[in-house]
């Protein structure tokens, strides 16, 4: 907390500029008008303030806006955003995607901080759902974002937003999350033709039920083993040898290398040896 002291003669700030970097903390407190700071926030980022000086500037804004900053200020916080606590951010009402992007840019290249997580949470709750543009933005900055959400949170994702999802965005999703996302993806891509549909739906198949896998096996999709290994065990077990062979196509040979791993191991144990022998892979049930 900086003590209240009068501003020395001639030091009253007329605008936010480079001369302020030579001000001591108490001088910034005394000589910079909070309202001026708020209207010229966009200039702060261009000035190499120390962390201590930024603390003073934040303190001034906190005094001016005890109920939370307006979006016009938030959008131009820049590196001052890194000084905010989750408690500060919970007071904000961020509705503009541009504001969100500007703040995410400040944290770019770093892990998602508690501040960023709070910001995103506030933004998404304010919008009511994870629309396509928001999802596009969030996954661009944080590819693992989608998989950080709970199944309950994912249920608010509209099918139209699924178009923004890239395969790498689902890399860390667990089966429970894919169970929620798969039906949305199926709905989103339903009007695509066979091969195009498979390319899009492939990343979501960890949530697919047996009947959908059976249907895919009739379409010459040539599923790769990496995708097959991520399928739900309970969805794979009822598939016949013929269905798995048609589902994997030329990749069926890969079953040999995975015969000791789930779901392949459990599936092999469910099959008749005569049926397994038709594959010519030496699989032992």
């Amino acid at each position: 907390e900086v003590e209240k002291t009068a501003c020395p003669s001639g030091k009253k700030a007329r605008e936010i500029d480079e001369s302020l970097i030579f001000y001591k903390k108490w001088e910034l407190e005394a000589c910079v008008d909070a309202a001026l700071l708020a209207t010229q926030m966009d200039r702060v980022n261009a000035i190499p303030f120390t962390y201590e000086q930024l603390d003073v500037l934040k303190h001034k804004l906190d005094e001016l806006y005890p109920q939370g900053y307006p979006e016009s200020v938030i959008q131009h916080l820049g590196y001052l955003f890194l000084k905010m606590s989750p408690e500060d951010i919970r007071k904000w009402n961020v509705t503009s995607l541009e504001t969100l992007k500007a703040l995410l840019e400040v944290n770019k290249g770093h892990e998602m901080s508690p501040q960023v997580a709070t910001l995103i949470d506030r933004f998404v709750k304010g919008r009511g759902q994870l629309d396509k543009d928001t999802l596009d933005t969030l996954t661009a900055f944080y590819p693992g974002y989608l998989c950080s959400l709970s199944p309950e949170e994912l249920s608010s994702v509209p099918p139209s937003s699924i178009w923004a999802v890239r395969p790498q965005d689902l890399d860390t999703c667990d089966p429970r999350q894919l169970d929620v996302l798969y039906p949305k993806a199926r709905l989103a891509f339903q009007n695509m033709n066979g091969s195009e549909y498979f390319v899009k739906i492939q990343s979501f198949l960890g949530g697919a039920p047996t009947e959908d896998l059976k249907a895919l096996s009739q379409q010459n999709v040539s599923m790769d083993l990496a995708t097959f290994m991520k399928l739900r065990t309970d969805a794979v077990l009822p598939l016949t040898v013929a269905e798995v062979q048609k589902l994997l196509g030329p990749h069926v040979e890969g079953l040999k290398a995975e015969e000791r791993h789930r779901p392949v191991r459990d599936w092999i144990l469910r099959q008749r040896q005569d049926d397994l022998d038709t594959l010519g892979l030496g699989l032992q049930g």
């Epitope: 062979q245 196509g249 030329p250 040979e253 290398a257 038709t278 594959l279 010519g280 030496g282």
Partner: nanobody
Framework: EVQLVESGGGLVQPGGSLRLSCAAS?????MGWFRQAPGKGREGVAH????????VYADSVKGRFVLSRDNSKNTMYLQMNSLRAEDTAMYYC??????????????????WGQGTLVTVSS
């Protein structure tokens, strides 16, 4: 359309060896050798998944025949050792692009060579 050309057949004495070759016009993931003796049906002899090289053999040739491939030449080879009179047949090379049915069933394969004759006789 995959073109398959076999070679290497001929006359050999019992206990002798032959090496059959099958050259494909393009890469295929799955290739096999079938044979058909006079008056009999076509039977699967051996099969290879060309990418990983996984092989399987009919019980009647296991331990005597060895299947290999050279992917740089899109060619499959069948080394036949300890040949017997009952190995006499027309040997066909086959390839498939659609994966249905057993490796030993001719109906599972969509491309075939013209065949090369192997005669085992003293």
């Amino acid at each position: 359309e995959v073109q398959l050309v076999e070679s290497g057949g001929g006359l050999v004495q019992p206990g002798g060896s032959l090496r059959l070759s099958c050259a494909a016009s393009e890469f295929t993931y799955s290739m096999g050798w079938f044979r058909q003796a006079p008056g009999k049906g076509r039977e699967g002899v051996a099969h290879i998944y060309t990418r990983g090289g996984t092989t399987v053999y009919a019980d009647s040739v296991k331990g005597r025949f060895v299947l290999s491939r050279d992917n740089s030449k899109n060619t499959m080879y069948l080394q036949m050792n300890s040949l017997r009179a009952e190995d006499t047949a027309m040997y066909y090379c086959a390839a498939r692009t659609i994966f249905e049915g057993s490796w030993s069933s001719p109906s599972s394969f969509d491309f075939w060579g013209q065949g090369t004759l192997v005669t085992v006789s003293s």
